[in-house]
């Protein structure tokens, strides 16, 4: 039961995470105009991975797509790539994990196959989450660098009569969505990997059995022999010898923590 719960929870957490990664990638507010210590402009600028927007105080909003590929900064392209790779891996992971779910029966799929699929999807979720976290972090680093550069510019060349409003950008909502979503996908992936251990049929599945020889109270414990060693072993037959194959409830699931920003 614990394996099913861990796997199911891992799937749900990953699903939420990947939905968040998709949302963050599509959001326009990756960077927003910094309003602190600025003259109050009646125009608010914000930028996403795909377009930049201007919201006037009148309520009118105008967005323009980045209609160039070569003219964009390499870092922005890298962030786009990381987010897309994260989404693609996550989507494939979700597809694989649906078939790997213990509660879903597809034909005569063996536990070992489900275990492998669970592990595969878990790894995919982990990589997907890492891609999203990396993408968001690269963008955040780019913002911090540009912020301090523009701050330095604000305090140079102010000697003239005419002043220009230096637009500085700070973290937008999409960054926080991306970090949380990446973290959730990562946690979901770890949970899937943990669940995989409980799904995998183990090589030695016997509990100690006591054989009472007449007149002696000596307990013999079967050592290192296997239930079936031949090729094409039928795991279904193992149940005959299985005095206590680990039940789903006995699998240990480790509590995981994530910080919500």
């Amino acid at each position: 039961m614990a394996v099913t719960a861990c796997q199911g929870l891992g799937f749900v957490v990953s699903l939420i995470g990947i939905a968040g990664i998709i949302a963050a990638t599509c959001m326009d507010q990756w960077s927003t105009q910094d309003l602190y210590n600025n003259p109050v402009t009646a125009v608010f600028n914000y930028q996403g991975l795909w377009r930049s927007c201007v919201r006037e105080s009148s309520g009118f909003t105008e967005c323009r797509g980045y209609f160039t590929l070569l003219g964009l900064p390499a870092m922005l392209q890298a962030v786009r790539a990381l987010m897309i790779v994260g989404i693609v891996l996550g989507a494939i992971g979700l597809l694989v994990s649906i078939f790997a779910l213990k509660c879903i029966r597809i034909g005569s799929m063996e536990d070992s196959a489900k275990a492998n699929m669970t592990l595969t999807s878990g790894i995919m979720f982990i990589v997907s989450g890492l891609c999203a976290i990396a993408g968001v972090s690269v963008f955040a680093n780019m913002l911090v660098t540009n912020f301090w550069m523009s701050t330095a510019n604000m305090y140079t060349g102010m000697g003239g009569m005419v002043q220009t409003v230096q637009t500085r950008y700070t973290f937008g909502a999409a960054l926080f969505v991306g970090w949380v979503a990446g973290g959730l996908t990562l946690i979901g992936g770890v949970m899937m990997c943990i669940a995989c251990r409980g799904l995998a049929p183990e090589e030695t599945n016997y509990k100690a059995v006591s054989y009472h020889a007449s007149g002696h109270s000596v307990a013999y414990k079967p050592g290192g022999f296997k239930a079936s060693t031949g090729f094409g072993s039928n795991t279904k037959n193992k149940k005959i010898y299985d005095g206590g194959a680990r039940t789903e409830d006995e699998v240990q699931s480790y509590p995981s923590k994530h910080d919500y920003v």
Partner: antibody, heavy 118, light 113 residues
Framework: EIQLQQSGAELVKPGTSVKISCKAS????????MNWVKQSHGKSLEWIGN????????NYNQRFKGKATLTVDKSSSTAYMQLNSLTSEDSAVYYC???????????WGQGTTLTVSS | DIVMTQSPSSLTVTAGERVTVGCKSR????????????LSWYQQKPGQPPKLLLY???TRESGVPERFTGSGSGTDFTLTISSVQAEDLAVYYC?????????FGSGTKLEIK
Amino acid sequence: EIQLQQSGAELVKPGTSVKISCKASGYSFTGYNMNWVKQSHGKSLEWIGNINPYYSNTNYNQRFKGKATLTVDKSSSTAYMQLNSLTSEDSAVYYCARHVRGNSFDYWGQGTTLTVSS
Amino acid sequence: DIVMTQSPSSLTVTAGERVTVGCKSRQSLFNSENQKNYLSWYQQKPGQPPKLLLYWTSTRESGVPERFTGSGSGTDFTLTISSVQAEDLAVYYCQNNYIYPFTFGSGTKLEIK
């Protein structure tokens, strides 16, 4: 047809307060901010502030904070401006104007003449 | 507050003449993100409320004759009336629409000979 109909001229005593109304028709009232502008006799225009009728958010010109209070009544599509502690300096024509793209003001009320005199 | 300086304060022209009205801002009204200058021009005829002519420096409001054109960027702006008509007798105001509080120029009074 879009119209901003303002209340009639007011003659008030110094120290009192007055509430000017601006009834909007011909468009979605909550979809556009309403601005208020002061024009003293023979002088230029002065922006007082604006209000978002949907959320009732306000922006004031620092010079008019404490002097003007902007409110709206969504049910009657009417914007109000209350002017407090009136002095002769407040004698002017007050306009309401709709806020549109470019942060410009496309439709204006006909103006309300306020005269503060003892 | 951003001071908007208009010049000249008044001018008298004959019908058919070309007129230019200047407006200077103490601070740039240019928004780099959408490459637009947040400056509007208004026309106020005697006894009437102001009427919007141009916004974003050069975008003509619907119903405004083509003889009214706007130009400039950053801090220097110009309103041009290519061929003045008798009905253009009015006071023209420029307005900063970029930084709060929105401020207007002192106005340019156009008179027809």
